[in-house]
Amino acid sequence: FERTRSLQDPCSNCPAGTFCDNNRNQICSPCPPNSFSSAGGQRTCDICRQCKGVFRTRKECSSTSNAECDCTPGFHCLGAGCSMCEQDCKQGQELTKKGCKDCCFGTFNDQKRGICRPWTNCSLDGKSVLVNGTKERDVVCGPSPADLSPGASSVTPPAPAREPGHSPQ
């Protein structure tokens, strides 16, 4: 099949890093500077990605593979291939169009990216607030108020972990 294909299409013999040059009787020409082809049989080479501005080069472009970018310090990547960079904020903040802003009361962000999220509402699970929330941290929910009645143990010791197929020691 490969032999048949090459007889029909001389371009299929052109390896990665070259292109099939129609202007030169379909011979395989090397990709020009700042371009690449990552597969064989290409009729053109793609232009290399330039990591400029807020991007920095993680991997240089070669004749057979594109450059890869990441973001300069103080920024983080967005998208699978780091196609966008976004400014970091401090924990307890979120990025708006006007820059980093503190989380509103009742919300938190424990990362340098993303948005402020509402504190967990412990009462929805019938629990009480054990540790108050801050701009940087969610509330910690504790046992329900009923569990804390006199004589009741406030913390139940965890059952011993048992892995499948193993008998307890």
Epitope: I47, Q50, G79, A80, G81, K97, C100
Partner: antibody, heavy 114, light 110 residues
Framework: EVQLVESGGGVVQPGGSLRLSCAAS????????MHWVRQAPDKGLEWVAI????????YYADSVKGRFTISRDNSKNTLFLQINGLRADDSAVYYC???????WGQGTLVTVSS | QSVLTQPPSASGSPGQSVTISCTGT?????????VSWFQQHPGKAPKLMIY???KRPSGVPDRFSGSKSGNTASLTVSGLQAEDEADYYC??????????FGTGTKLTVL
């Protein structure tokens, strides 16, 4: 050679819809964020929207938020802009551009008129 | 959306130098070294002339140069030529992924 070719513009009535397309070639489209930028007649450039390589992040100008939707088909090397609820002040040439604005298409004209 | 401020027009004779300013805030121009400049001839798409404040893409003549001081960026065109007559726009990164452009300057070669 990098090429960006926009299409889908035309004359539409207020409140109407259009879907603009931008066909890309000469670069690895799937690795780049892409923009739409518009320019009203005899006016300046106005950024409209950006989409990340994998569509996970989309940002819009306040003036179009809720009415415009940016999307892409990496298998077809094509960028889209769905524009709904068109208003007279949306009349403009719409350009697609590669992130960092290294390369621009020639634009497609959208005219909103009753 | 905020916009960067440029003078509406600038002019110069062939061979002279002309500087176009672009004023923003410390949230955009002042906060980052990521200013770009574009040239646009009538009926044509914009073309990137300067990026990262003062870097030129390949193919752009070295007559075009950029600089920045505080919240103001500048584009200087030296040895002015007839083909430099066009509209010029600045743009700045602003932290989030909403891009902002300048109001535009019409450069006339006298």
């Amino acid at each position: 050679e990098v090429q960006l070719v926009e299409s889908g513009g035309g004359v539409v009535q207020p409140g109407g819809s259009l879907r603009l397309s931008c066909a890309a070639s000469g670069f690895t489209f799937r690795t780049y964020a892409m923009h739409w930028v518009r320019q009203a007649p005899d006016k300046g450039l106005e950024w409209v929207a950006i989409i990340s390589d994998d569509e996970t992040h989309k940002y819009y100008a306040d003036s179009v938020k809720g009415r415009f939707t940016i999307s892409r088909d990496n298998s077809k090397n094509t960028l889209f802009l769905q524009i709904n609820g068109l208003r007279a002040d949306d009349s403009a040439v719409y350009y697609c551009a590669v992130h960092d604005f290294d390369f621009w298409g020639q634009g497609t004209l959208v005219t909103v008129s009753s | 959306q905020s916009v960067l401020t440029q003078p509406p027009s600038a002019s110069g004779s062939p061979g002279q130098s002309v500087t176009i300013s672009c004023t923003g805030t410390n949230s955009d121009i002042g906060g980052y070294n990521y200013v770009s400049w574009f040239q646009q001839h009538p009926g044509k798409a914009p073309k990137l002339m300067i990026y990262d404040v003062n870097k030129r893409p390949s193919g752009v003549p070295d007559r075009f140069s950029g600089s920045k001081s505080g919240n103001t960026a500048s584009l200087t065109v030296s040895g002015l030529q007839a083909e430099d007559e066009a509209d010029y726009y600045c743009s700045s990164f602003a932290g989030s992924n909403n891009s902002i452009f300048g109001t535009g300057t019409k450069l006339t070669v006298l």
